[in-house]
């Protein structure tokens, strides 16, 4: 069964910078990745980025840069301009649409005890549905 993993890390040098890493474990080719925060996309979450391997990438503030790391994983850099970081307690969700499997989504957040530079373990936390 395909799985999605989500990893959130705070940058050691910039406490206001976070990076979300997401990956798809399974066969098939990725057609679209949607990253959202505050919940799954379309279910209370707000879009942060959409990535397509050929058609391009798009991100929305506070996301700074979205890019492919491998053919099945992406990273999203976030910049927190506020004095206190809302990212620390936020859930980030990644939805991978793949052919022929359909859509798979998982969510993750920064562990409460995280030191800068440490990250949440890349454990898939399947939520919602596989369309």
């Amino acid at each position: 069964t395909p799985e999605v993993w989500v990893q959130v890390q705070m940058e050691a040098t910039e406490l206001s910078s976070f990076t979300v890493h997401c990956g798809f474990l399974g066969p098939g080719s990725i057609s679209l990745v949607t990253v959202s925060w505050g919940g799954p996309d379309g279910a209370g979450g707000t879009k942060l980025a959409v990535l397509h391997p050929e058609l391009g990438t798009r991100q929305w503030a506070p996301a700074r840069q979205a890019r492919w790391e491998t053919q099945s994983s992406i990273s999203l850099a976030l910049e927190d301009s506020g004095a206190s970081s809302p990212f620390a307690n936020t859930t980030f969700c990644c939805k991978f649409a793949s052919f022929p499997e359909g859509s798979w989504e998982s969510c993750g957040s920064l562990p409460p005890s995280s030191d800068p530079g440490l990250s949440a373990p890349p454990t898939p936390v399947p939520i919602l549905r596989a369309d």
Epitope: L32, V50, L51, H52, E54, L55, G56, T57, R58, Q59, Q65, A66, R67, W68
Partner: antibody, heavy 119, light 107 residues
Framework: EAQLQQSGPELVKPGASVKISCKAS????????MNWVKQSHGKSLDWIGD????????TYNQKFKGKATLTVDKSSSTAYMELRSLTSEDSAVYYC????????????WGQGTSVIVSS | DIQMTQSPASLSASVGETVTITCQTS??????LAWYQQKQGKSPQLLVY???TLAEGVPSRFSGSRSGAQFSLKINSLQPEDFGSYYC?????????FGAGTKLELK
């Protein structure tokens, strides 16, 4: 077949405002963001911004903030752009253009609306 | 914002000739470069995206390539309907930015 039908040409006075429309047909209106692009006479293309018809959320090119306001009417599958405090610099052809995910390629284009600012 | 430097600004060629238009980007946009064609008095139309993928219905005489931050659009064996203006555009985030354009005229 996707089609974008824009409103007709406008001749407006300096300092006035103008609102141009773009009616979409042939596709699901909420599946594509609506972009607006400016083309001054004989010049290149300038992206003004886009709007998500599903929730009305818009993104603007910094240089057009305060100049353009993007709105949509889902019930009629129509997008609007209002331009305010018009000057001769705003005289141009304005295009609406629809883009599907990830909303960075301009897939379908309207025929353009000419706006001339003159006293 | 990502700056797009397109050259040449204008180009005269004859039917049957081969021409190349280039576009240089100020930042790394990976392969996310598109080309649009605009005929006189008409709307622009997507021609090529992701550096070299032809949009639906685009003839194979059009081809795109990349060398570092420089992207090229090549048109082999020019046809009468190919004359007009060409614009490059990155599709790596917003704001979307375009090159200044290349006007391809009949010699």
């Amino acid at each position: 077949e996707a089609q974008l039908q824009q409103s007709g040409p406008e001749l407006v006075k300096p300092g006035a405002s103008v609102k141009i429309s773009c009616k979409a047909s042939g596709y699901t209106f909420t599946d594509y963001y609506m972009n607006w692009v400016k083309q001054s006479h004989g010049k290149s293309l300038d992206w003004i911004g886009d709007i998500n018809p599903d929730n009305g959320g818009s993104t603007y090119n910094q240089k057009f903030k305060g100049k353009a306001t993007l709105t949509v009417d889902k019930s009629s599958s129509t997008a609007y752009m209002e331009l305010r405090s018009l000057t001769s610099e705003d005289s141009a052809v304005y295009y609406c253009s629809a883009s599907g995910p990830p909303y960075v390629l301009l897939d379908y284009w309207g025929q353009g609306t000419s706006v001339i600012v003159s006293s | 914002d990502i700056q797009m430097t397109q050259s040449p600004a204008s180009l005269s060629a004859s039917v049957g000739e081969t021409v190349t238009i280039t576009c240089q980007t100020s930042e790394n946009i990976y392969s996310y470069l598109a080309w649009y064609q605009q005929k006189q008095g008409k709307s622009p139309q997507l021609l090529v995206y992701n550096t070299q993928t032809l949009a639906e219905g685009v003839p194979s005489r059009f081809s795109g390539s990349r060398s570092g931050a420089q992207f090229s659009l090549k048109i082999n064996s020019l046809q009468p309907e190919d004359f007009g203006s060409y614009y490059c555009q990155h599709h790596y985030g917003v704001p979307l930015t375009f090159g200044a354009g290349t006007k391809l005229e009949l010699k």
